[in-house]
Interface confidence: medium
């Protein structure tokens, strides 16, 4: 069936649409195109023959028609009148005619809209506006948009005249927002230029910050007055009612108790024509003298003396108080407070009551601190430490021995070899030692405040060849699935690897084993019965190597569940019961029975001789080991028949 | 197993010098001390010094000390002793001996040792 | 450097006889060391620190001694045993060996 196509349908003017034909019968005459729904010679626009191919324009034709062979029909720079239907009259060249109705639609491209509006500064909670988007435009959809995003539902949002008008009843200052419309048809669609809402509001009740309102003699007042207002707010200050300024800062140096007072800010919007004010009550308070602290000892010894403290000046009706540390004072029997708490004694001080201490005293507004007073406790000297910890060294290196005792003030050293004194250094320093420098190293620490004097002395070895090690060990008894046990490879030498075999093997790989201290510690962790084997440490340098004695671990474990044998639970009248209780344990645990709850002997094996029915019932032992602190027990029952 | 595989005999001019290979299989060098001896011809053993292969620590006898220098090449497991300025003394057998107890104990590893003849 | 003295520099020994060589060293040590050397091999360890008999050596071979003064004994000479043996030191630098002593199968 011959039908006709319009590309597109819907056409802008000035733009080209195409009548396309569908379905062109054969042996074809000729075609002529006309404007409207029938055939009618005054309103041809253009006839064709095939055979001449001639085109033939007709009353209707306007120079803007081109006519195709395959009878589809172009019509150029569409102009409103365009609109419309198009029918297609086909010849045959058996003179049989045909025909077919197209159309298409012709709209304006829109212009690009703007918004007016009837109320530029709307005032907040009393004030419509009203948009209008222009122009008004024929066959065309009115859309608007609110900060890009389509319109909120809202019962203050009315759209009318077919959505031209967007109304906003009764603005809030939430309504400054970027309003754009946009209209559309069929061919085009445009945006207008955001017009922003000013919505005209407070000023709301004033904030003044900061919000302190007590202050002491001599500091700077500085009050800053905010209100919420479009446009911004004018403020101006008042003093216990008297006007000040018109700012929005009020600053007054150097207050005195006279500043006290309300202090009222007021803050007005001309375009609203509204004013809101804040009072705020400020207290300005005496300012008290700074403390600072007195001591009756200001070099006290550790151990020996008493410092007491005292914080000055003294002050009826005061509130005192102190500070360690910067942490409130703790709880010691060697702190005591005098009645008034102005007084702090330390008793027999140590070392680590340095301080600082401060004392504070307390008025209505704050506390005021005195500086900080660090006490100069005289100590020591404790037992001088020799570094580095080696005690075998190998020929040929140098030999830097440092000494150190915590003392105060710091210790005077002297070092001495063999008992003969070499030199008053904290450090000895010999090169390139050889075996004549093995010996006995003294290093003497003094005080000379205290006049105490410590010592400490250290066999430094020195050798090539490795001595035969031996295993110390920090628990020597430890228990099963609890203890940790440190095994440590004596001595520490220099340059020295250190390696450990367990049972004549070389370290199983286990997460409980941890090597430390450069392979000289093993440590481990959650110690169970199987670890109670043989452990040797070994140590090797470059020439030499030695293993030490094993040392056996003596795990404590246990007691397992015991077990009663012989297992027969069922005996006839007249036997005689002999029943061995058996438990895994070390040390051996201590064994006891019971008979139907009743505690019986303290024995592993319970015998009783030509049993009866009366011997039936429940036989319990019960396992303690003392060592382990651990209890078990297990019951069985025993049927005698007559 | 542990072995010390040393490299062929060398002669040598005099005023020369020589670079002798130990390669060790069985075990990783860097584990070990490698220590060199040498025999001078119907003498007894003499001890040059020691190379610690993972960090290049040396020792040498001062008689040693600028005519003997230590290398290795851990990649490869070899230990080389370099010889220089040689002179009819130098006219030993050069063993090298693997110092840390794989046995277990010491001095367990020898190579074959090579020989180095000096000419004048 | 600590200088090693063996004694005697030769000596003879018929099988299943008790040799004894001795080794002095010029300043004491804390242990001593002993190898075997077959001609045309490399020395073996057979005693290690004073007394600990080396793997694989056979038991008739034992060590003593203490400060400067140390020996190595056989306690019955076989065949196998005709070697030249060296104490070393290993307690200072530079390690030193003994000269050596020579033990003939007699």
């Known amino acids: 069936k011959l039908t006709i196509e319009s590309t597109p349908f819907n056409v802008a003017e000035g733009k080209e649409v195409l009548l396309l034909v569908h379905n062109l019968p054969q042996h074809l005459f000729g075609y002529s195109w006309y404007k409207g729904e029938r055939v009618d010679g005054n309103r041809q626009i253009i006839g064709y023959v095939i055979g001449t191919q001639q085109a033939t324009p007709g009353p209707a034709y306007s120079g803007r028609e081109i006519i195709y062979p395959n009878a589809s029909l172009l019509i150029q720079n569409i102009i409103q009148n365009d609109t419309g239907f198009y029918t297609l009259h086909v010849i045959k060249s058996d003179l049989v005619n045909e025909e077919a109705t197209g159309q298409f639609r012709v709209y304006p491209e829109l212009p690009k809209p703007s918004i007016s509006s009837n109320n530029s500064k709307p005032v907040e909670d009393k004030d419509a506006v009203a948009f209008t988007c222009e122009p008004e435009t024929q066959d065309a959809t009115y859309l608007w948009w609110v900060n890009n995003q389509s319109l909120p539902v809202s019962p203050r949002l009315q759209l009318s005249n077919g959505n031209r008008t967007l109304t906003l009843f009764n603005v809030t200052r939430n309504d400054t927002a970027s309003y754009k419309c946009e209209t559309q048809n069929p061919v085009s669609a445009r945006r207008s230029d955001s017009v922003i809402l000013n919505v005209l509001y407070g000023p709301d009740a004033p904030t003044i910050s900061p919000l302190n309102t007590s202050y002491r003699s001599g500091e700077n007042l500085n009050l800053s007055c905010h209100a919420a207002s479009n446009p911004p707010a004018q403020y101006s200050w008042f003093v216990n009612g008297t006007f000040q300024q018109s700012t929005q800062e009020l600053f007054i140096p150097n207050i005195t108790v006279n500043n006290s007072g309300s202090y009222t800010c007021q803050a007005h919007n001309s375009d609203t024509g509204l004013n809101r004010t804040t009072v705020t009550t400020i207290t300005v308070y005496a300012e008290p003298p700074k403390p600072f602290i007195t001591s009756n000892n200001s070099n006290p010894v550790e151990d020996e003396d008493a410092v007491a403290l005292t914080c000055e000046p003294e002050i009826q009706n005061t509130t005192y108080l102190w500070w360690v540390n910067n942490q409130s004072l703790p709880v010691s029997p060697r702190l005591q407070l005098s009645n008034d708490n102005r007084t702090l004694t330390l008793l027999s001080v140590t070392r680590n009551d340095v301080g600082p201490y401060e004392c504070g005293i307390q008025n209505e507004l704050s506390v005021d601190h005195s500086d900080p007073v660090i006490l100069n406790v005289l100590y020591g000297p404790d037992d001088p430490t020799i570094s580095p910890s080696y005690t075998y060294y190998r020929p040929g290196v140098n030999l830097s021995l440092s000494c150190h005792a915590a003392s105060n003030p710091p210790a005077q050293y002297s070092w001495l070899i063999d008992g003969n004194i070499q030199q008053h250094t904290q450090e000895l320093f010999i090169s390139n030692i050889t075996e004549k420098n093995s010996g006995l190293y003294t290093c003497q620490a003094n005080n000379s405040a205290s006049g105490h004097s410590r010592t400490t002395v250290k066999t430094i070895t020195v050798s090539a060849e490795l001595p035969k090690p031996s295993i110390s060990s920090n628990n020597s008894k430890p228990v099963e699935d609890k203890d940790a046990v440190a095994f440590t490879c004596e001595p520490e030498a220099q340059n020295t690897t250190y390696l450990w075999w367990v049972n004549g093997q070389s370290l199983p790989v286990s997460p409980r084993l941890q090597l430390s201290n450069g392979n000289r510690t093993l440590t481990l962790f959650n110690v169970t019965r199987n670890d109670a084997r043989a452990y040797v440490c070994g140590i090797q340098n470059s020439v030499s190597a030695n293993r030490s004695d094993p040392v056996t671990l003596d795990v404590l474990y246990g007691p397992d569940t015991p077990i009663i044998s012989p297992p027969d639970s069922s005996y006839l009248s007249g036997a005689n019961l002999n029943l061995s209780c058996h438990s895994a344990s070390n040390p051996s645990p201590q064994y006891s029975w019971r008979i139907n709850g009743i505690p019986q002997q303290h024995t592993q094996v319970l015998f009783i001789a030509k049993i009866t029915p009366n011997n039936n019932g429940t036989y319990a032992c019960f396992v303690s080991n003392l060592a382990t602190g651990r209890n078990n027990s297990i019951v069985k029952s025993i049927t005698v028949s007559a | 197993q542990v072995q010390l595989q040393q490299s062929g005999a060398e002669l040598v001019k005099s005023g020369g010098s020589v670079k002798l290979s130990c390669t060790a299989s069985?075990?990783?060098?860097?584990?070990?001390?490698m220590h060199w001896v040498r025999q001078g011809p119907e003498q007894g053993l003499e001890w040059i010094g020691w190379i610690d292969p993972e960090n290049g620590d040396t020792e040498y006898a001062p008689k040693f000390q600028g005519k003997a220098t230590f290398t290795t090449d851990t990649s490869s497991n070899t230990a080389y002793l370099q010889l220089s300025s040689l002179t009819s003394e130098d006219t030993a057998v050069y063993y090298c001996?693997?110092?840390?107890?794989?046995?277990?104990?010491?001095?367990?590893?020898w190579g074959q040792g090579t020989t180095v003849t000096v000419s004048s | 450097e600590n200088v090693l003295t063996q004694s005697p520099a030769i000596v003879s020994a018929s099988p299943g006889e008790k040799v004894t060589i001795t080794c002095s060293a010029s300043s004491s040590v804390s242990a001593m060391h002993w190898f075997q050397q077959k001609p045309g091999t490399s020395p073996k360890l057979v005693i290690y620190?004073?007394?600990n008999l080396a793997s694989g050596v056979p038991a008739r071979f034992s060590g003593s001694g203490s400060g400067t003064s140390y020996s190595l004994t056989i306690s019955r000479m076989e065949a196998e045993d005709a070697a030249t043996y060296y104490c070393q030191q290993r307690d200072s630098y530079p390690l030193t060996f003994g000269a050596g002593t020579k033990l003939e199968l007699k």
């Open positions: 069985g075990f990783n060098i860097k584990d070990s001390y």
């Open positions: 001996n693997e110092g840390t107890p794989h046995g277990p104990y010491y001095f367990d590893y």
């Open positions: 620190s004073t007394s």
